[in-house]
Interface confidence: low
């Protein structure tokens, strides 16, 4: 049994991580990650460590954070290697050829590993209450841990699409992640959302020669706004467009441009939106073949009972507090995955809006295998 990810996320470096709560042996955890097109995760220093810590801290798993949990990671000491008491990893090593950071910049050991130069030993990440990383702990490979961490490496990623009027965002990544938010999405990720009127829309991240882009995205937002303003990618009204310092914090929707007053949007002859910041607004790049001038489309959701009210208030476009994400047209409900991963700096944003990683790795295939969610 390979449950879907409890939580996952991607950083701009092209690396994605997923955390799973499932009692299993080390080999089974490895296989579960491979089935998703990834590998058991390394948790090296710096960005990688921060990303994994963010996943853990996003919330407890089964049990509600009442006990310490152990997660399999790609850390082991091979049979012929000795315990090294003065080394940060105590003679253990990461099972990948990733260029690592300083090994000294790592978590501490919860318990010192047994001295040995003969037996192969595995290690787990122990999390206090299931959320606060305590450190590494030696564990026999045939024993069962409470969960595991997978890592996936991609050449390009799609930046999160701007919601506009969309609510109920649901991300389905190729490594069987269902989530309410992803800062960056690998090719194959499908984003479903509800536009006004509970009408669903779906777009997919695809990779081509230029980079990664959202296929079937009609314009620059998931759902067009009824008004003229967007703030942080979501529809807004003019009164909500001033920041704490009184600056104009909105951008103009497609078909409008910043007025001469610098704090309102007027009908645009060009039809190009402009970005308004707290300083001087800057113009968005013109539409290209990969980011066409928006045209409204009208997808639909029809899985409500007659006379029922919508599941989500149409004006509340928050994507981090939705308890459940239904798959359109199905009876089952997937659990929402909370994410909170910071974007890292090892990436370039292309004119088409995709993220091209400057970081290459042999950790896993750049094209993850699909994993049937019916067995998840």
């Amino acid at each position: 049994e390979h449950p879907t990810a409890d939580r996952a996320g991607c950083s701009a470096s092209g690396a994605c991580y997923s955390l799973h709560h499932a009692t299993m042996k080390r080999q089974a955890a490895e296989e579960a990650c491979i089935l998703r097109g990834g590998a058991l995760s390394t948790v090296r220093a710096g960005a990688e460590l921060r990303a994994v810590l963010a996943l853990l801290r996003a919330g407890p798993g089964p049990g509600g954070g009442s006990k310490d949990l152990l997660f399999w990671v790609a850390l082991e000491r091979r049979r012929s290697h000795c315990t090294l008491e003065n080394e940060p990893l105590r003679g253990f090593s990461w099972l990948s050829s990733d260029p690592g950071g300083l090994e000294s910049d790592t978590l501490q050991w919860v318990e010192e590993p047994q001295r040995s130069c003969t037996a192969r030993r595995c290690a787990v990440l122990q999390a206090t209450g299931g959320v606060e990383p305590a450190g590494w702990k030696e564990m026999r490979c045939h024993l069962r841990a409470n969960g595991y961490l997978c890592k996936y490496q991609f050449e390009v990623l799609c930046p999160a699409p701007r919601p506009g009027a969309a609510s109920n965002l649901s991300y389905r990544a190729p490594f069987q992640l269902h989530s309410a938010a992803l800062d960056f999405s690998p090719p194959g990720t499908e984003v479903s959302a509800l536009c006004r009127g509970q009408l669903p829309i779906s777009v997919t991240c695809i990779a081509d020669e230029i980079g990664a882009r959202w296929d079937k995205l009609s314009g620059d937002v998931l759902c067009p706004c009824p008004g003229r303003y967007l703030r942080a990618g979501k529809c807004a009204e003019l009164p909500n467009c001033l920041d704490d310092l009184g600056g104009f914090a909105c951008e103009c929707a497609t078909g409008f441009e910043l007025g001469k007053d610098g704090r309102s949007c007027v009908t645009s002859g060009e039809g190009q939106p402009t970005l308004g910041g707290t300083g001087v607004p800057t113009r968005r790049p013109p539409a290209t073949a990969t980011s066409p001038v928006p045209q409204r489309t009208w997808p639909i959701r029809v899985d409500e009972k007659l006379g029922e009210t919508p599941l989500v208030p149409e004006q509340d476009n928050s994507v981090t507090s939705i308890p459940e994400i239904p798959r359109w047209g199905s009876q089952s409900t997937m659990s929402t995955l909370q994410m909170s991963l910071q974007a890292e700096s090892k990436a370039t944003i292309t004119p088409s809006g995709s993220v091209i990683s400057k970081f290459n790795s042999t950790t896993s295939s750049a094209t993850p295998q699909a994993f049937d969610s019916s067995s998840a």
Epitope: R196, G197, Q198, L199, P200, I201, S202, K216, S218, P224, P226, R296, T297, W298, P299, I300, R301, V302, D303, E304, K305, L306, G307, E308, T309, P310, E314, W328, G329
Partner: antibody
Framework: EVQLLESGGGLVQPGGSLRLSCAAS????????MSWVRQAPGKGLEWVSV????????YYADSVKGRFTISRDNSKNTLYLQMNSLRAEDTAVYYC??????????????WGQGTLVTVSS | QSVLTQPPSASGTPGQRVTISCSGS????????VNWYQQLPGTAPKLLIY???NRPSGVPDRFSGSKSGTSASLAISGLRSEDEADYYC???????????FGGGTKLTVL
């Protein structure tokens, strides 16, 4: 009781125009999404257009885009379909249909009896 | 040619169970809910099943809908003469950005 009554159909020459109306009663018209669906003689159903309840946003099937305009007058509880540049293939019975509920445009839970539009020279 | 494929005709005797299929693709039935409409001779269509398997009030439980993958089906048990009508399936199609209907199935009660 929910009632939808279409009118305005008739015979028109190719290239001509026609305006269909749909008078609604028995429900809060302004709160519902409304659509037009047509059916050519002896053929199947074809969705034509929809209009939102709130801001009046409109959407059209590719076959009528640029030629047909859907609109509504909430004060009169009436839905309209302005049809320009009519073609022979637009000949059909035009039904006005109500969306499932006040927050869903589909499916169509109530239909009018239809009005026949014939485009012929 | 309709986007959703239905058999043009189906028949059965009173009391029998008849099934009408509706085949689509991942961009319509595979992604979105299926609705079924009944059109009695000379009348407007009527919503029979919505969201794959739900019956609006007033529709007898002899009518049931189901969906699997990119196909859906409407089952009518205990067939009656008044069930003789045209039946249409409908679903939203993401790639076409349109609501699409099947070509319709004419049900004859023998």
């Amino acid at each position: 009781e929910v009632q939808l009554l279409e009118s305005g159909g008739g015979l028109v020459q190719p290239g001509g125009s026609l305006r269909l109306s749909c008078a609604a009663s028995g429900f809060t018209f302004s709160g519902y999404y409304m659509s037009w669906v047509r059916q050519a003689p002896g053929k199947g159903l074809e969705w034509v257009s929809v209009i939102y309840s709130g801001d009046g946003s409109t959407y059209y099937a590719d076959s009528v885009k640029g030629r047909f305009t859907i609109s509504r007058d909430n004060s009169k509880n009436t839905l309209y379909l302005q049809m320009n540049s009519l073609r022979a293939e637009d000949t059909a019975v035009y039904y006005c249909a109500r969306g499932l509920n006040s927050s869903s445009a589909l499916p169509f839970d109530y239909w009018g009896q239809g009005t026949l539009v014939t485009v012929s020279s | 040619q309709s986007v959703l494929t239905q058999p043009p005709s189906a028949s059965g005797t009173p009391g029998q169970r008849v099934t009408i299929s509706c085949s689509g693709s991942s961009s319509n039935i595979g992604s979105n809910a299926v609705n079924w409409y009944q059109q009695l001779p000379g009348t407007a269509p009527k919503l029979l099943i919505y969201a794959d398997s739900n019956r609006p009030s007033g529709v007898p439980d002899r009518f049931s809908g189901s969906k699997s993958g990119t196909s859906a089906s409407l089952a009518i048990s205990g067939l009656r003469s008044e069930d003789e009508a045209d039946y249409y399936c409908g679903s939203w199609d993401y790639s076409l950005s349109a609501y699409v209907f099947g070509g319709g199935t004419k049900l004859t009660v023998l």
